[in-house]
Amino acid sequence: SPLPITPVNATCAIRHPCHNNLMNQIRSQLAQLNGSANALFILYYTAQGEPFPNNLDKLCGPNVTDFPPFHANGTEKAKLVELYRIVVYLGTSLGNITRDQKILNPSALSLHSKLNATADILRGLLSNVLCRLCSKYHVGHVDVTYGPDTSGKDVFQKKKLGCQLLGKYKQIIAVLAQAF
């Protein structure tokens, strides 16, 4: 099934001019994501039922091994490249989580809605980051890694991997919002 974010392996050929206050828009989107991250996390683990709500440290701890790194003290260009990688990773992961949750928790409509809304903001953020990288730094291609494919996991693993990812998302988005 299609994932919500397909990164562009492109040369710097931006079809539309970048938004005037691009960095402000990026900051605004990060703040928006940061402001809703905890609510999304709570909504997710509550929807999974036991044993998740009472075992958050064990089942939802942010120990995602292949998560792209971020260095808050880097240059703007370096930070934007790392942000791009993170947003791609989060976008594909969120796509997997949304797909799984539609099967595992078909009636958790508020969770589906919040996952979709988050994916929408990430899509916009990705577009803005790419625009900034292209227009200011002439970076048209960034090597990326994708979130883990949960297709072949059992029910418990699907739920656990989703919870760990959202735990990590909540943690990293706070760092990113602060860094920009």
């Epitope: 036991e50 044993p51 799984d100 297709s151 072949g152 029910v155 418990f156």
Partner: antibody
């Protein structure tokens, strides 16, 4: 008609090897599907042995009793599931069933007729 | 590690009787439980999935209930064709130490 047909069972000595096959017809292995092996010792209950996701990732799962000795695999082009059984023991004697499950793989809605493996 | 315990291991009943079989999981499996019927020399047949959903073509006298750790299969009015062995199966976790199937319940003629 959707069907699973197992083959490859037979008599083997302890420590020996055997490879079971399960040919699927009526559906494609390229779909979002899990294939599994479930066994039943004579006069005993059902025991899950192993599962594999037939999609790209090919995730595999094994019961503790067979881990390190049995290997599950699939050939999507042939629509066939395999179980390579090495270091066989007397307690592996059973009818081996091939079973299929849809996402999220929480129940087996398709079963083969079974093939008998005797380790003696 | 999930352990599945089925009870009773056997039950003697007559045609028309109501039969209830219980399956307990050692930890929560949410509603991911299935029930199968098996007759001698045949492969298992799916009856109920996700604790209470009746598989297509299965008579409505079969019903399932429960969630979390305790589940039941009920045959409201036993028919001659129902004398068989019944198994519960958790579909929540397939880790190497998890028990997937219950031990089985043989329904015999009284």
């Amino acid at each position: 008609e959707v069907q699973l047909v197992e083959s490859g069972g037979g008599l083997v000595q302890p420590g020996g090897s055997l490879r079971l096959s399960c040919a699927a017809s009526g559906f494609s292995f390229s779909t979002d599907y899990w294939m599994s092996w479930v066994r039943q010792a004579p006069g005993k209950g059902l025991e899950w042995v192993s599962s594999i996701y037939v999609g790209t990732s090919g995730d595999t799962y094994y019961a503790d009793s067979v881990k390190g000795r049995f290997t599950i695999s699939r050939d999507n082009s042939k629509n066939t599931l395999y179980l390579q059984m090495d270091s066989l023991r007397a307690e592996d004697t059973a009818i081996y069933y091939c079973a299929g499950a849809d996402n999220p793989y929480d129940y087996f809605n398709l079963w083969g007729q079974g093939t008998l493996v005797t380790v003696s | 590690d999930i352990q599945m315990t089925q009870s009773p291991s056997s039950v003697s009943a007559s045609v028309g009787d109501r039969v209830t079989i219980t399956c307990r999981a050692s930890e929560t499996i949410s509603g991911y439980l299935a029930w199968y019927q098996q007759k001698p020399g045949k492969a298992p047949k799916l009856l109920i999935y996700r604790a209470s959903s009746l598989e297509s073509g299965v008579p409505s006298r079969f019903s399932g209930s429960g969630s979390g750790t305790e589940f039941t299969l009920t045959i409201s009015s036993l028919q001659p064709d129902d004398f068989a062995t019944y198994y519960c199966q958790q579909g929540y976790s397939y880790s190497d130490t998890d028990n997937v199937f219950g031990g089985g319940t043989k329904v015999e003629i009284k």
